[in-house]
């Protein structure tokens, strides 16, 4: 018996087609992805093959103005239109709190939403009961398939799930659900979830009875053969893990941003064992036409976005200096504003010992592309912010050793004075440079804001300590020459859309007046 699994993950509000790098589509003839194109390919496969499941492994939320404006209603609407069979909850589904998940998505989705390792308690338990499930058994052709969901246990540090949801260890939570399905004669089981490729592989290895793992969170690109675009494969598709009980378990993921549709064919024997698995992600490029009815619906929903981008978010009473003459050479108040917004967006009261789990921000000055003039009545709009942050990136959470941070700050000024983008703007950091010293030895003081303290204060950076830092995904991926970050990071979790972080902060503050305050000094 053969099953076709079509899968997406980490779509992050890319409802419209995008450029090859998943940013805003500029040249339509070379654009990719988007729900209208995805629908065309899904329907083509559904018509051609008998047993097809369309699954999403989480993080539909967050990433473009679509989410900022529609807050998840767009996810439910277009996933319903594509007739997804199931979705696992990702960490970003909690970005607007539990209410922001329940109302627009859980109550409106016409497909099961899954997570076995999220347990509700207190007053939320009855409110959320039945709105998401640990698993769902689906009839597929003449057989039944169990889909078991899971979500990153790090979600409380990455999003805003509140205090009434407990995120258990994925493997511990999945095993009893799989065991239950087995006793009920469900012998074909897919684990669908959002914890990253390393956890996906562990689930394949450790959870007895899981036949296939469909994952997300790490934006992992797997491919067998010559890859069709710029993404470099992290391994073959499917990636085969040998389980502790000796089975070959295929593990798949489909990069991110709706650029690819994962396509996996699994052959099962009559006892539900996987005999074979093969496939590849399908690049959703312009050779696949956009479905006209879905495209028309997108265009209808699009109107509200255009109106939103010119509305006032808040006011500035000072000039927001985002000029390259400032931000690539010295502390600039636009950099301070953005870093303050980044930290504010990551406020999660961890426990009594920590005032917050993260206090530091770094931001490449070259990523700040425009100033905002306060003389236009002080008005700040989304449109203004899109000029400052035009690349459609995210502000991510990483864990780094102090020694890596020190290297990063040396890199920040290794060729100082040439107006290059790697000069770092900061938050929760005090750095002093001596440019008379040779490159690689110019950081003379580096103090960082404590997190394990009731009154935050600056302490010298410790080389062997592990620190959490918020930074642009561009830097996490080694951009602007920050190879040491990419090579030495200990953990990387993708965060919220950059413009959204800053716009939310400005809306919250209402009036802003960021200063240059001595975060970066030269001796």
């Amino acid at each position: 018996w053969e099953l076709t699994i079509l899968h997406t993950n980490d779509v992050h509000s890319r409802l419209e087609q995008t450029s090859e790098d998943s940013s805003k589509c500029v040249n339509a003839s070379r654009c990719m992805g988007g729900v209208a194109r995805l629908f065309t390919k899904v329907q083509q496969i559904r018509r051609a093959e008998p047993n097809v499941l369309l699954l999403d492994a989480g993080d539909q939320y967050q990433g473009t103005i679509w989410f900022t404006v529609y807050k998840g209603a767009e996810v439910a609407h277009f996933m319903n239109a594509l007739r997804y069979d199931a979705m696992a909850l990702g960490n970003h589904e909690f970005d607007n709190g539990v209410e922001g998940l329940i109302e627009p998505l859980l109550k409106e989705a016409k497909f099961p939403i899954l997570s076995a390792n999220i347990k509700a308690k207190g007053p939320l338990a009855s409110q959320i009961s039945g709105l998401y499930l640990p698993y769902k058994v689906l009839p597929v052709g003449d057989e039944v398939v169990g889909i078991v969901g899971y979500t990153s246990k790090e979600t409380p540090f990455l999003s805003n799930p509140g205090t009434n949801l407990v995120f258990e260890d994925e493997i511990t939570a999945l095993q009893p659900e799989v065991d239950k399905l087995k006793t009920l004669n469900v012998n074909k089981i897919i684990a669908l979830g959002h914890s990253g490729f390393e956890t996906d592989k562990l689930i394949a290895q450790k959870v007895r009875g899981v036949d296939v793992v469909v994952g997300g969170h790490s934006n992992t690109f797997l491919y067998t053969g010559n890859p069709p675009s710029k993404e470099v494969p992290a391994g073959k598709y499917p990636f085969i893990v040998t389980s502790d009980d000796g089975r070959k378990v295929p593990v798949v993921q489909a990069y991110a941003f709706g650029k690819y549709l994962g396509y996996l064919k699994i052959e099962f024997d009559e006892r539900g064992n996987v005999i074979s698995s093969h496939g590849n992600p399908i690049l959703l490029n312009s050779s696949i036409p956009e479905d006209p009815s879905i495209k028309a619906d997108i265009n209808k929903w699009r109107i509200k976005l255009d109106n939103y981008s010119t509305q006032e978010l808040g006011k500035t009473i000072v000039y927001l200096d985002g000029s390259s003459q400032s931000c690539r050479f010295r502390e600039c108040n636009m950099g301070n504003l953005i870093c303050d917004a980044m930290i504010n967006n990551n406020l999660r009261h961890a426990d009594e010992m920590f005032w917050n789990h993260v206090s530091m921000c770094i931001l490449n000055g070259g990523g700040i592309r425009s100033p905002i003039d306060e003389r236009n009545n002080g008005t700040i709009t989304w449109e203004n912010l899109a000029a400052v942050l035009p690349f459609g990136g995210t502000f991510d959470l990483v864990q780094l050793k102090g020694s890596t941070l020190k290297k990063a700050f040396e890199h920040s000024v290794h060729r100082y004075g040439q107006s290059t983008g790697e000069f770092l703007q900061v938050g929760g950091i005090h750095v002093v440079y001596d440019l008379s010293r040779k490159p690689g030895d110019r950081v003379v003081k580096l103090d960082v804001l404590c997190t394990k303290c009731r009154v935050p204060s600056y302490d010298p950076l410790k080389m062997d300590e592990i620190y959490k830092v918020i930074l642009p995904n561009f830097l996490a991926n080694g951009g602007d020459g920050f190879q040491m970050i990419k090579d030495e990071l200990l953990r990387h979790d993708s965060g919220d859309q950059d413009i959204n972080v800053v716009s939310t902060y400005i809306s919250k503050m209402k009036v802003i007046y960021p200063a240059v305050e001595g975060r970066i000094k030269f001796s």
């Epitope: 497909f111 009961s129 039945g130 499930l133 052709g141 057989e143 239950k180 469900v186």
Partner: antibody
Amino acid sequence: QVQMKQSAAEVRKPGASVKVSCKASGYTFTDSNMDWVRQAPGQGLEWMGDINPNNGGTIYNQKFKGRVTMTIDTSRSTAYMELRSLRSDDTAVYYCARTNWDYAMDYWGQGTTVTVSS
Amino acid sequence: DIQMTQSPSFLSASVGDRVTITCKASQDINSQLSWYQQKPGKAPKTLIYRANRLIDGVPSRFSGSGSGTDFTLTISSLQYEDMATYYCLQYDVFPRTFGGGTKLEIK
């Protein structure tokens, strides 16, 4: 509005077969599975099976396996349930019911009475 | 197969009363439970699915609750037209199984 119109009552002798039809309207036929449920006189409801109109895939209650066949004709938006080797205890009202996105039955046909008597 | 035990099997109540019918599954059914109303000589009518979601057009006096193995159908203020037999169904796994029914009579 969603409607399911079933075929008329049938009388059969033991050992014979019966085929009940269910014509759906008011929605896209291939978007929802169809379940079949029966109810013997004065008794409760009993689930018989499920069919997917897209591919004809069926899940049967083991109790009826080998005796029941569920089929579809998408051009007519009609589902069929055939029960063979009829016995007197197969006398019942047979219902078709559409399932919603959650695979829960939501709209029901009016029922078809099948009487098995020698 | 999962067994569904409904209670009571017979219930008599007055117009305006609050009525509750319970359904117990032999094991956790993951909120995959629906409730049906059947009047004599008629086809069943779906009231609730996913334990607590009301089907469009069903009066708001009907509500469902519960999770795991224990579920309840509540009629907040009984009306004459509610006289019927009520069934629960688990659709968590195959085969789907119904409760034995609760016959509700108006005093």
